[in-house]
Interface confidence: low
């Protein structure tokens, strides 16, 4: 079966060694290696020069990693940064709240524990399905990435399902129906994988998808001008009609002698069966 | 493919330690891994996962006292204060889903002790 | 907090026998199917049995087979071999504020 990599996976940045992974180029990163390594760009003002990109490099800022606490916003001041509180927060870095439990601030039905004076914080304890200091953001229950072989996860609220790629089945897509391992082709035949299934090349007087029925040659006709067709062990002999030779009678004897028949490879008489 | 666990040895209690499991023939960076831990005698105890998208959970026991990190080949535990009660066989493993971790690491025993 | 129990302790079958080990869950598994199965021998680490309550793991054999949802799981062993003495233990996934595994307490297979 061809390799299929995680679905989502960056075809630009992102390669796989076996069915279901997403490994990153160099300079990218993220689970689907959507991610660019660093974000700085060249026209970044500070830092050191890289030697490998000739990039400048930001050097470590004031607002890197975000110091403002409860989703504040970090912006660089001449001396240091300053912290845009939401509503309901306040200090450096955002890190007081002035909210209680009475303003309700638990979202998605989560649950607030926490004093009833101004001074006092509080904690939300989320139901499932739910994060966050709020209980704000719905977790993504598809990043468990449940589904094998880049089968899409499908949230259905009461379930995660599978949508498999075509060649793959199972509740996590993890049997691989165009897999040979294990699929036995009968009387010789060998397993050959595409299309979505396995199927079988049969030996010669074999058929069927797993070469278990016994073909009749005979049955498509290849004697050509009225010869007769005699199965073989080896696979068929047919009996010109008279004027007709070759392995299939389709070459016309000639009154004269002489056939049409090309010129016979060393070692082979005009009219023997050619196998 | 295949998993190693470093760094277990014999410890005071309130010692921080760091464990590293090193991956071998693939990359750490696209699978979950996670940490377990089995006291002598004892059962298995999960203790915390990174998953592919670099998220880390634990379990509520180890939320402070366990941190896990990791690059393209190694995942670390580190410890912040170790008690006699850890004194345990730590294994780390790989999964490709959250119901499967077929791939383990032999496990690095550490020892708390004063 | 979840807790998982596995039954029984311990057990002992005959070799070509049959033993059978539940896992009850107190809330139910993600999924109703995040369960797996493991396999761990003395001073060895756990091998991948059974992952999503029933699909067989690479390499093992069919003779021990998953099933169960939600809270309720059981692993069976059929035509015992003397290889299959070992511990087996279940492990869950849940979703609560984030994502947690647990583990079962485990289960000894005794082969006579």
């Known amino acids: 079966a061809p390799l299929v990599c995680r679905a989502g996976c960056s075809p630009e940045h992102g390669f796989c060694e076996q069915p279901g992974e997403c490994r990153c180029l160099e300079g990218w990163t993220g689970p689907l290696c959507t991610v660019p390594v660093s974000t700085s760009s060249c026209l970044s003002p500070r830092g050191p020069s890289s030697a490998t990109t000739g990039c400048l490099v930001p050097g470590p800022g004031p607002c890197d990693g975000n110091p403002c606490a409860n989703g504040g916003s970090c912006s660089e001041t001449p001396r240091s940064f300053e912290c845009t509180c939401p509503r309901g927060f306040y200090g450096l870095r955002c890190e007081v709240s002035g909210v209680t439990c009475a303003d309700g601030p638990c979202f998605n039905g989560g649950l607030c524990v926490g004093g009833a004076d101004p001074d006092s914080a509080y904690i939300c304890h989320c139901p499932p399905g739910f994060q966050g200091s709020n209980c704000e953001k719905r977790v993504d229950r598809c990043s468990l990435q449940p589904c094998r072989n880049g089968g899409l996860c499908l949230d259905l609220g009461h379930a995660l399902r599978c949508r498999c790629r075509a060649g793959f089945a199972g509740p996590r897509c993890e049997h691989d129906l165009d897999d040979c391992a294990g699929r036995a082709c009968a009387n010789g035949g060998t397993c050959v994988e595409g299309g979505g299934a396995h199927r079988c090349s049969c030996a010669l007087g074999f058929g069927g998808r797993d070469c278990r029925e016994r073909a009749d040659p005979c049955a498509a006709r290849p004697c050509a001008h009225g010869g007769r067709c005699y199965a073989h062990f080896s696979g068929l002999v047919c009996a010109c009609a008279p004027g007709y030779m070759g392995a299939r009678c389709e070459f016309p004897v000639h009154p004269d002698g002489a056939s049409a028949l090309p010129a016979a490879p060393p070692g082979l008489r005009p009219g023997d069966p050619q196998r | 493919q295949s998993l190693e666990e470093s760094g277990g040895r014999l410890v005071t209690p309130g010692t921080p330690l760091t464990l590293t499991c090193t991956a071998s023939?693939?990359?750490?960076?696209?699978?979950?891994m996670i940490w377990v831990r089995q006291a002598p005698g004892k059962g298995l105890e999960w203790i915390g996962i990174?998953?592919?998208?670099?998220s880390t959970y634990y379990a509520s026991w180890a939320k402070g006292r366990f941190t896990i990190s990791r690059t393209s080949t190694t995942v670390d535990l580190k410890a912040t204060s170790l008690t006699t009660e850890d004194t345990a066989t730590y294994f780390c493993?790989?999964?490709?889903?959250?119901?499967?971790?077929?791939?383990w690491g032999p496990g690095t025993l550490v020892t708390v002790s004063s | 907090d979840v807790v998982m129990t596995q039954t029984p302790s311990s057990v002992s079958a005959a070799v070509g026998g049959t033993v059978t080990i539940n896992c009850q869950s107190s809330q139910s598994v993600y999924n109703s199917d995040f369960l797996a199965w493991y396999q761990q021998k003395p001073g060895q680490p756990p091998k991948l049995l059974i992952y999503a309550a029933s699909t067989l793991a690479s390499g093992v054999p069919s003779r021990f087979k998953g099933s169960g949802s939600g809270t309720q799981f059981t692993l069976t062993i059929s035509d015992l071999e003397c290889d299959d003495a070992a511990t087996y233990y279940c492990?869950?996934?849940?979703?609560?504020?984030?994502?947690?595994?647990?583990f079962g307490g485990g289960t000894e297979v005794v082969v006579k």
């Open positions: 023939g693939f990359s750490l960076n696209t699978y979950h």
């Open positions: 990174v998953d592919s998208g670099g």
């Open positions: 492990q869950g996934t849940y979703e609560d504020v984030g994502w947690f595994n647990d």
């Open positions: 493993a790989r999964g490709g889903s959250w119901d499967g971790f077929n791939i």
